[in-house]
């Protein structure tokens, strides 16, 4: 068990803060909830603190919850590939460029680390080149979320990881908006981290609303499990 992994044996409170600017539309989001890495489970509620969110909530899911990949469930035989927990409590910097097909792009940078007993994901997001009446600024996405695989590989030069995946957002007219994600994680501290073999995270997310919440918001339930590395030969012959 890595030192950081010991911090995730129970339920951990999570705080998310996002400051964003998309095509000059400025906004802020606050989120809180909890994570349980034993089950790879996240429950979070996000509120736009500046009024109405200028972009559809689903476009921010990866920035919020795929940001705290330290809550992914890594099976016993894969624990030595869990970069995310090994970087704790000092945490990691997570940078992404997200290209929305035939539309604009988001650039994000986040620091994910423990502040006391709380896991904090503090994010900044800049969006440019979006069409005013496109799927994103025109709010044409359905309020739901598909399952995805998130592909992880070690980046030995930077003592971190590189992550690639493609998100499929459902559009109201029945078509799909693709969002290509290019991600890089580097540790904040200088302690040892686990550099993984290639593998993937399997994610399932459910979006809902709080019937008692008047502000623009999103409620998120998510399950994430690591996969893609088989048991070693010694395991097979037991």
């Amino acid at each position: 068990m890595s030192k950081g992994e010991e911090l995730f044996t129970g339920v951990v409170p999570i705080l998310v803060e996002l400051d964003g600017d998309v095509n000059g539309h400025k906004f802020s989001v606050s989120g809180e909830g909890e994570g349980d890495a034993t089950y790879g489970k996240l429950t979070l509620k996000f509120i736009c603190t500046t009024g109405k969110l200028p972009v559809p909530w689903p476009t921010l899911v990866t920035t919020f919850s795929y940001g705290v990949q330290c809550f992914s469930r890594y099976p016993d035989h894969m624990k030595q590939h869990d970069f995310f927990k090994s970087a704790m409590p000092e945490g990691y910097v997570q940078e992404r460029t997200i290209f929305f097909k035939d539309d604009g792009n988001y650039k994000t940078r986040a620091e994910v680390k423990f502040e006391g007993d709380t896991l904090v994901n503090r994010i900044e997001l800049k969006g440019i080149d979006f069409k005013e009446d496109g799927n994103i600024l025109g709010h044409k996405l359905e309020y739901n979320y598909n399952s995805h695989n998130v592909y992880i590989m070690a980046d030995k030069q930077k003592n971190g990881i590189k992550v690639n995946f493609k998100i499929r957002h459902n559009i109201e007219d029945g078509s799909v908006q693709l969002a290509d994600h290019y991600q890089q994680n580097t540790p904040i501290g200088d302690g040892p981290v686990l550099l993984p073999d290639n593998h993937y995270l399997s994610t399932q997310s459910a979006l809902s609303k709080d019937p008692n919440e008047k502000r623009d918001h999103m409620v998120l339930l998510e399950f994430v499990t690591a996969a893609g590395i088989t048991h070693g030969m010694d395991e097979l012959y037991k």
């Epitope: 400051d19 600017d21 503090r122 900044e124 997001l125």
Partner: nanobody
Framework: GGGSVQAGGSLRLSCAAS????????MAWFRQAPGKEREGVAT????????HYADSVKGRFTVSRDNAKNTLSLQMNSLIPEDTAMYYC?????????????????????WGQGTQVTVSS
């Protein structure tokens, strides 16, 4: 990293911070020309994604930061004589309201010692 340059040229200023975790601070560049008031040039959010520029430098200057190395930079291109001034880097803790508060020029309360930039025609 100040200095003298001909109009149309480029310069890069750097500022090294110490004694605080830069990733929790807004950073900014200011300048003061002889006989004029100090004016804001550019601000940058704690994680370096959200920038803001004075109209007079938009499209010519680019602010960036490297939190791992605790440095702030200002790349100045297409310089004009009106850019001649003493340039200062400045910092302030991330406001309670978040990174959007970094654009408040008057709130900056930690200052570097300044470097002279001279642009001749």
């Amino acid at each position: 990293g100040g200095g003298s340059v001909q109009a149309g040229g480029s310069l890069r200023l750097s500022c090294a911070a110490s004694g605080f975790a830069m990733s929790t601070y807004c950073m900014a560049w200011f300048r003061q020309a002889p006989g004029k008031e100090r004016e804001g040039v550019a601000t940058l959010s704690p994680l370096g994604i959200l920038s803001h520029y004075a109209d007079s430098v938009k499209g010519r200057f680019t602010v960036s930061r490297d939190n791992a190395k605790n440095t702030l930079s200002l790349q100045m291109n297409s310089l004009i004589p009106e850019d001649t001034a003493m340039y200062y880097c400045a910092a302030m803790p991330r406001p309670d309201g978040g990174a959007h508060g970094c654009v408040s020029w008057l709130a900056y309360n930690f200052w570097g010692q300044g470097t002279q930039v001279t642009v001749s025609s």
